[in-house]
Amino acid sequence: VPRWRQQWSGPGTTKRFPETVLARCVKYTEIHPEMRHVDCQSVWDAFKGAFISKHPCNITEEDYQPLMKLGTQTVPCNKILLWSRIKDLAHQFTQVQRDMFTLEDTLLGYLADDLTWCGEFNTSKINYQSCPDWRKDCSNNPVSVFWKTVSRRFAEAACDVVHVMLNGSRSKIFDKNSTFGSVEVHNLQPEKVQTLEAWVIHGGREDSRDLCQDPTIKELESIISKRNIQFSCKNIYRPDKFLQCVKNPEDSSCTSEI
């Protein structure tokens, strides 16, 4: 007789999830010498322990503490790049500008990026069929709790000038309901962070508007200013040229506005 299994509204655990996490951990520790001490089997055991045999709507930050402990690393606090709704360009940027870090350039962010996972209460099985959706099912699911926890701590770790890349093609360039708008903005520490600098990325080739004047950007400025952090904003009119100029800053065409 097949056991009754809870059906959730979201996609199930990413196939080959354990193998993927372990392989990513090994790759990360090979590329980053300062993380060579990390035992990837222990990392996987801690990751698994955060959600296996637990109800997938009842996950807490504490469940991830053992994983957090194993994944602790030195991230230069003044080289942090946050992003909202423009992940690919942010990652392309840090792949070129190697001294800057998005959350996904840290071990924990790298392990979990683009993956889904959940378990089932009282069984050691991983649920590959379905996982809770944040809106339709519950917010305290394994994936949402993980990202909320690491996003908060990433913002708390930031200092001096923090950069955020925002998508100028969206109707809400700054969205209060995004992870950046609901978690990271509110966890920047005024005693450590001097300035938040927004980079608004333009989508259209002939788009010459000043998107720093957008009402949602003004709303972000207001929130940040109230937290005693300075705010600045730059338009990135040509993201392709922007990346090219990060790669080759000496290029003569890189002195003009991008």
Partner: nanobody
Framework: QVKLEESGGGSVQTGGSLRLSCAAS????????MGWYRQAPGKQRELVVG???????NYADSVKGRFTISRDNAKNTVYLQMNSLRPEDTAVYYC?????????WGQGTQVTVSS
């Protein structure tokens, strides 16, 4: 893997001075916020002073004008010079580095101020 070790604690009379040191196992002061915290018996751990790589310093009101933080990047050491000590400064003093996602703490050094 960053490790922190505090030293310099001890017993002193009211009005006396002590200099605490926090030695880091790696060169981190140009990359991480550092802080001195203290915990008195039966109380919560509290921030005494923090410093970020740019040099901005944030002192707790209770120690302003009496305590000074400094760092020696070449020696991977951060210092806390404590002057005009008071009995209420009695606590275990901890050094902290803001690693991600969890901070890294030293084991602490006891400071006792008697009247």
């Amino acid at each position: 893997q960053v490790k922190l070790e505090e030293s310099g604690g001890g017993s002193v009379q009211t009005g006396g001075s002590l200099r605490l040191s926090c030695a880091a196992s790696a060169s981190i002061f140009t990359r991480l916020p550092m802080g001195w915290y203290r915990q008195a018996p039966g109380k919560q751990r509290e921030l005494v002073v923090g410093i970020v790589p740019s040099g901005r310093i944030n002192y707790a009101d209770s120690v302003k004008g009496r305590f000074t933080i400094s760092r020696d990047n070449a020696k991977n050491t951060v210092y806390l010079q404590m002057n005009s000590l008071r009995p209420e400064d009695t606590a275990v003093y901890y050094c902290r580095a803001d690693t991600f996602p969890l901070p890294t703490w030293g084991q602490g050094t006891q400071v006792t101020v008697s009247s």
